[in-house]
Amino acid sequence: IPPHVQKSVNNDMMVTDNNGAVKFPQLCKFCDVRFSTCDNQKSCLSNCSITSICEKPQEVCVAVWRKNDENITLETVCHDPKLPYHDFILEDAASPKCIMKEKKKPGETFFMCSCSSDECNDNIIFSEEYNTSNPD
């Protein structure tokens, strides 16, 4: 770190790689929870107009799709993959694409994905063909 830039103790805003270089933060769609018309499709766009700079450079993009008897919602956020989200680990955080995986939640259908390329939670993918390891 250049000497004129203070390095704070226990500062998770200053994330460095193995060479000491500062990591840029992720750019993610960030509309929190919105009603959605995404249903029975192989993939959907988030229809979120806000692309936000994630607060911490270790954060990745997350999308959560939920369907119950009343409505469908899509949540788009940044989140630290070291921490659970909705009580689930972000196991696919290194993926460049947001491949939805179903999670068990009583009373609703619940899918979640995470990914680590810019605005990758804008395009959420449900199609089974992506759920095996896909190099794209």
Partner: nanobody
Framework: EVQLLESGGGLVQPGGSLRLSCAAS???????RMWWVRQAPGKGLEWVS?????????YYADSVRGRFTISRDNSKNTLYLQMNSLRAEDTAVYYC?????????????????WGQGTLVTVSS
């Protein structure tokens, strides 16, 4: 290679405005996504805003959205940050940074090309 020099900081009252500039030397300015980053006294880095080289699409941190506007003039190799409705919590040293192009944007900051920054103090 692009080297960066920030200017335009100063003392301003709450609610006031400032315009920061970042002059880039080097012929490759138009290849880089550019950022404004700030560091408040005793705090860590906060990523404030970014702008794409082509199309000039912009991104903001929630803390400054609607108050700050990032822009660039590729013909002048200059990056700008218009700061309105300034608050005490905007007090910081402001740096510009370049993000290298790649298949996807490189996620590491080339530390050889930090400027000295420009100090913004918001106080009555």
């Amino acid at each position: 290679e692009v080297q960066l020099l920030e200017s335009g900081g100063g003392l301003v009252q709450p609610g006031g405005s400032l315009r920061l500039s970042c002059a880039a030397s080097g012929s490759t300015f138009t290849e880089y996504r550019m950022w404004w980053v700030r560091q408040a006294p005793g705090k860590g880095l906060e990523w404030v805003s970014a702008i794409e080289p082509i199309g000039h699409r912009t991104y903001y941190a929630d803390s400054v959205r609607g108050r700050f506007t990032i822009s660039r003039d590729n013909s002048k190799n200059t990056l700008y940050l218009q700061m309105n409705s300034l608050r005490a919590e905007d007090t910081a040293v402001y740096y510009c940074a370049k993000q290298a192009p790649g298949e996807k944007w490189a996620r590491r900051w080339d530390l050889d090309y930090w400027g000295q920054g420009t100090l913004v103090t918001v106080s009555s």
